[in-house]
């Protein structure tokens, strides 16, 4: 079983603040109480949980850094989604900060790809067509809205 198999709920169905755990687990948007008897809702805009869990606390929502824009807010079942501001990008090998895109290509090269939040401009040599920069990093996996299940390793 991989985490790929476990799709979280985008927004938990309306529930009371407390419900009972199922096999010791609480659904997305909740955490377990210290005595293990209740599932307690995460606080909207403050914390979240994307998966079935037995966490004693929900996870703290990410705050977008300066230089980032908030694409979607934190809900009880999904963390904040931040994206680099226009004209900047986040590299795969330094994901902690947004870097300025280059304004143009070096001499003898031509631009074939624009600046995006995930990649710098892409330049190729005029004659050979070989790339000057690395591959464009993949965009983060898309969140689906199908509910998560309390899956676990099987013997």
């Amino acid at each position: 079983i991989t985490q790929q198999d476990l799709a979280p709920q985008q927004r938990a169905a309306p529930q009371q603040k407390r419900s009972s755990p199922s096999e010791g687990l609480c659904p997305p948007g909740h955490h377990i109480s210290e005595d293990g008897r209740d599932c307690i809702s995460c606080k909207y805009g403050q914390d979240y949980s994307t998966h079935w869990n037995d966490l004693l606390f929900c996870l703290r929502c990410t705050r977008c850094d300066s230089g980032e824009v908030e694409l979607s807010p934190c809900t009880t079942t999904r963390n904040t989604v931040c994206q680099c501001e226009e004209g900047t990008f986040r590299e795969e090998d330094s994901p902690e900060m947004c870097r300025k895109c280059r304004t143009g290509c070096p001499r003898g090269m031509v631009k074939v790809g624009d600046c995006t939040p995930w990649s710098d401009i892409e330049c190729v040599h005029k004659e050979s067509g070989t790339k000057h920069s690395g591959e464009v990093p993949a965009v983060e996996e898309t969140v689906t809205s199908s509910p998560g299940t309390p899956a676990s390793p099987c013997s």
Epitope: I1, T2, Q3, Q4, L6, A7, P8, P21, E23, G24, L25, I32, E34, D35, G36, R37, S49, T50, H51, W52, N53, D54, L55, L59, R78, N79, V81, E140, E141, V143, G148, P150, A151, S152, P153, C154, S155
Partner: antibody
Amino acid sequence: EVQLVESGGGLVQPGGSLRLSCAASGLPFNSYYMSWVRQAPGKGLELVAAINSNGGRIHYPDTVKGRFTISRDNAKNSLYLQMNSLRAEDTAVYYCTRLTYYGNPAWFAYWGQGTLVTVSS
Amino acid sequence: NIVLTQSPDSLAVSLGERATINCRASESVDIYGNSFMHWYQQKPGQPPKLLIYLSSNLESGVPDRFSGSGSRTDFTLTISSLQAEDVAVYYCQQSYEDPLTFGGGTKVEIK
């Protein structure tokens, strides 16, 4: 305060058997995944077995599958590891752990002090 | 199985200086905005202790000189100002996929 206390380790011959126990206190034992993690002398860490809160879901890596059996007694707040057909490579400190679940068994929140199992003739 | 490769194998850092430990996964451990990577500290003669979970969340009671960062395949544990009590072996661990696996460990010593 969470406490996990292992017992049952010792010296055993290759092909022999041993049963480890873990007594848990300070947590609602019947609510949590539990597991055994081992560490061979001077080596790294390896998950040996994991079990969910009611014993209905169990996981073993290929290295121990068919030889080791994890079980629990929630009424006694106890976790067990039955080890059969022991090999020299099973020599390690065996830790009882509380395994946090997040979409899958995820990280090891609490650890016991460990019990040493030595397989040697 | 996902293989975790830690670097360096050992690290000597002066007291008060920054220590940086890297962990590279053989495939991405990210999904739905979470990175399923965790960090532990093991002092000589003691069991491991959880420091960081889900890449960057500091476990309760762990000093804030410890921090975790990274995503997809590349992760870093940073000790911002090394203290004598930080001498230990540090392990990363992934829970993206079964079986759960650990890195080989990085030994941190005082220079």
